[in-house]
Structure formats: structure tokens, C-alpha cells
Amino acid sequence: AQNITARIGEPLVLKCKGAPKKPPQQLEWKLNTGRTEAWKVLSPQGGPWDSVARVLPNGSLFLPAVGIQDEGIFRCQAMNRNGKETKSNYRVRVYQIPGKPEIIDSASELTAGVPNKVGTCVSEGSYPAGTLSWHLDGKPLVPNEKGVSVKEETRRHPETGLFTLQSELMVTPARGGNPHPTFSCSFSPGLPRRRALHTAPIQPRVWEPVPLEEVQLVVEPEGGAVAPGGTVTLTCEVPAQPSPQIHWMKDGVPLPLSPSPVLILPEIGPQDQGTYRCVATHPSHGPQESRAVSISIIEPGEEGPTAGSVGGSGPGTLA
């Protein structure tokens, strides 16, 4: 069979080889398509099928507007004036090129080192479905490789039968990579062999989070064990710039003190014993807690424990 590719909505003429150009003609067109269940023989006199496929005076078959249901086989059997029989056989496939694909819900900023949604590529009105693919800086992105994941969805219009494709791209940008990557998406038709259709590119900014170094909590005296009436100094060291706000917690409860990197506990008493930690809050990172330090009181003659307790008479003061 001769393969014919026709665009949906366009007319198509199939020639009946060997048929006399004018009546009287001995010919028969039959078709097996999405509109039939088996072979349908078309009446040369015309009829209800003429809106779909009509035999012209020259014996050709005319399809005024090809549709998805017209995919299939078309055959003509003709006898010329000398009684010689000729058969024509066509395999018709149809296609529709969608509108230009678009990237919707695109991100303006991506964070390095974590998965980010880049955007959703949408193509509407294709047949057959075709495929969507993503590109980074002009090179194809392969799903499930190097932090790239793609979520695809294909829907079919209930009346037209045309396809809508959606492809959501997630990427994990490498630290120290291109700060302004260019993403684009393209639609490749299933039929015929045609160039891909490309979206306009998007160029989100990649934000590199400053690696958070640990918040260090230094205790004086070392070990945190102190005699009653002694003084304990807790210092919260954060390398990040600009300096974050430092708050203090005792036994998991925030202390009602103004932010400061140093907490002084003078004249330690039993009420000052407990577990202390500092919390550093940076505008772009959120809170970061230090390790916990135990402050305890040692009576005279006792060995100081590794993690100490402190005694005192009042609330701590801030340096």
C-alpha cells in the first residue's frame, strides 16, 4: 500500500489508477477506517458518505476535510476500456501540528543542592500525541540522571481527539554550577518527520546557599561544673556573615533575654542548673541550634563532672 500522510482538516484526493478519466467508468472504492467496522463500499452515485469521502467524476476519491476517523485503508479497483483491471491501495495516516509549546509556572530562582520545580511545558492540539523534551543550555536533559526528574501527563480532547501534553521538570542544580542556566522545551511530532517546535527559553537564577558551619557553644569553666556562687560564661560562636541573631534556651525553653552571643551566669545557684543551648537565626537560613551544654554545681571536695552544674542567686546577665 502507498503511505499517505494528511493534515487534519485539509482536503485529500486519492487517485484511482487505471480508471477512465470520464464516465462511463467501472470502478469501486472501498475503505476500512475508524468510521467503519469492516470494508465499506462507496456508492458511485454518492450518498451520506459524501461529507467524508466522495467519488469524483474522474474516478478519484475526494475527502473534503480529513479527520482522525479517516485513518485506515482506501482501495480502488478499476477496469479500463480494454478490460484491464488495476488496483490502487492507500494507507492513510493523519496528523495535526499543535500550537507552539509554552512553559508555564516557571521558576525565577532555583536553589543549588536541592530539588526545584523549573516549570511545566504544555503543548496543545497534536495528533498523534508526539513527545515533549527538555533542554539545558541547548543540550537534551535526560530524566532520572543527575538530579533531573520529569513528570508527564497526556490528555485527549473528548470531541476533537487531539492531544494535550504536559511535562513538569524538576532539577537539582549542582553547587558551583552555572548561575544563569537556560532551560527550554520542545515538542517532537509523532508524524510526519518534521522539525521540533521550541518554547521560548527561560533563565532562572541559581541561588547558592552559604554552607552552614556548625554553631559552636563554648563554656567557661570548661565542662560547665562550678562551685556555688561561681560564674559561668557561655559563648555562641557562629562563622556566618552577616552575624546572625543569637537567642538562648534553657531546658528547651527560650530565655527572655535580648539577643547576644554571650550569656553570663554570675553567682550560680541551684536554679541555674540545667541544659543550655544557643540558637542562631540567619535571615536566609532559618534557625540553627548549637549542641547542648549541661551546667551543674559541685559542692566543695567533689570532683568536677565532665559536664558541670552551676549555682547562683539570680538570673544571668548578658555581656
Epitope: 468510521r35 467496522e37 456508492s43 451520506p48 466522495r54
Partner: antibody, heavy 119, light 107 residues
Framework: EVQLVESGGGLVQPGGSLRLSCAAS????????MTWVRQAPGKGLEWVAS????????YYPDSVKDRFTISRDNAKNSLYLQMNSLRAEDTAVYYC????????????WGQGTLVTVSS | DIQMTQSPSSLSASVGDRVTITCRAS??????VNWFQQKPGKAPRRLIY???NLADGVPSRFSGSRSGTDFTLTISSLQPEDFATYYC?????????FGGGTKVEIK
């Protein structure tokens, strides 16, 4: 809302002529084939004529061929049936219907107009 | 020409009954059969298109089925407003042919 309104029916003598009209609204007229169907008093439905959306091709059963002519004016959203050489057996209610090809069959009908052929 | 033989030509039934009307085509007409309902003095109304599809606004108690060249209209539970005459139509070949009609009357 799709509407089909027939007019032009009446009493006519055998051998006479009559022209029926059908005014269409509520849809894109030139996208559809159109058809006339009739129903004799107390009888069933009978196909009379069909015309394609462009008006280039017309179709008739043998019972009315060469006597009846279907036509359309897409600019006026109107369908017509010219009936000549009328016979007593043409007495019927004539309905205008949308469709007539394999994509539609008939989906909407007018209310009908009565044609009586009698001396 | 294609003949559409419709049966029965009339039937008596009660509200709530299941009613079945059949049309047999004299040759293959594919799926190209419609069913219509007509009440006295009114235009026909399409119920089923292309053998099995329910037309817009038609109650779901109406259904159409096909087996080869036999086409069936079923009313699952007859309602008072369903007493009418029903016609099938083949629109696969010219001349387009209607069945003779089935009058559904109150028992």
C-alpha cells in the same frame, strides 16, 4: 439554541407547485447538511431530499426525483424545497431537519408545515 | 434499497415496564442508525445516534444496542411521558430509510 422554522405549506391542486422554506438559527448553517422529511397523515416518516453544506450536491429518492428541488442560501441561513407536478400522494407534513450525512443523521427538526394536494 | 423492518408495529405496556423495540436492516449499515420519538402533532425528537449513543437531554432509561444488522431501542422503565411512536433510521446509504414505526400505548 438550534431552531428550524418551516413555512410555505398550504393547499395546492394536483399538478401544481409549491415552495417551502426553512429558516435556521442557533448554529453555523453552512457547516451542516440539511434535509427535508415528510409524513403523510397517519403514516410513517419518509426521506424527501438532502443537500450538502455547500449546496453543490443534492440527493433525492426516486419518488420525488425530477419533481422536487432542494436548495439553500447560506447567506440567509435558509433551506428551500421547490415542489413541482404535485400529486395527491405528496400530501404530508414536511419537516426540515439538520443533517443527513453519516456524521449527524438528523439531530434537530422543525415543527413541520402541512402540504395538502387536492382538487 | 435498504429495508428497515421495525417490530413490533405497536405494543401495550404499563408504567415501569421494560420495553424493547427492534429494527433489522436488510444489509450492513454499520453503526449508522438513529432512533426517534414522536408524539401526536409534534416533530420527531432524536433519542439515540449512531446505534448506541444517547442524545443530549435524553433520559438514561433510553438505550440503544446493535448486533450485526439488528438494532434495538430499550426503555428500561417506561414513564407516562414515554407513550409515543418510535422510529429507527438508517443513514448509511441513499435512499435514507426509516422503520415503519412502533406505537407504544398504555395497557
Amino acid at each position: 439554541e438550534v431552531q428550524l422554522v418551516e413555512s410555505g405549506g398550504g393547499l395546492v391542486q394536483p399538478g401544481g407547485s409549491l415552495r417551502l422554506s426553512c429558516a435556521a438559527s442557533g448554529f453555523t448553517f453552512n457547516n451542516y447538511w440539511m434535509t427535508w422529511v415528510r409524513q403523510a397523515p397517519g403514516k410513517g416518516l419518509e426521506w424527501v431530499a438532502s443537500i450538502d453544506n455547500s449546496g453543490d450536491n443534492t440527493y433525492y429518492p426516486d419518488s420525488v426525483k425530477d419533481r422536487f428541488t432542494i436548495s439553500r442560501d447560506n447567506a440567509k441561513n435558509s433551506l428551500y424545497l421547490q415542489m413541482n407536478s404535485l400529486r395527491a400522494e405528496d400530501t404530508a407534513v414536511y419537516y426540515c431537519a439538520r443533517g443527513g450525512d453519516i456524521t449527524t443523521g438528523f439531530d434537530y427538526w422543525g415543527q413541520g408545515t402541512l402540504v395538502t394536494v387536492s382538487s | 434499497d435498504i429495508q428497515m423492518t421495525q417490530s413490533p408495529s405497536s405494543l401495550s405496556a404499563s408504567v415501569g415496564d421494560r420495553v424493547t423495540i427492534t429494527c433489522r436492516a436488510s444489509q450492513d449499515v454499520g453503526i449508522y442508525v438513529n432512533w426517534f420519538q414522536q408524539k401526536p402533532g409534534k416533530a420527531p425528537r432524536r433519542l439515540i445516534y449512531r446505534a448506541t449513543n444517547l442524545a443530549d437531554g435524553v433520559p438514561s432509561r433510553f438505550s440503544g444496542s446493535r448486533s450485526g444488522t439488528d438494532f434495538t431501542l430499550t426503555i428500561s422503565s417506561l414513564q407516562p411521558e414515554d407513550f409515543a411512536t418510535y422510529y429507527c433510521l438508517e443513514f448509511d446509504e441513499h435512499p435514507l430509510t426509516f422503520g415503519g414505526g412502533t406505537k407504544v400505548e398504555i395497557k
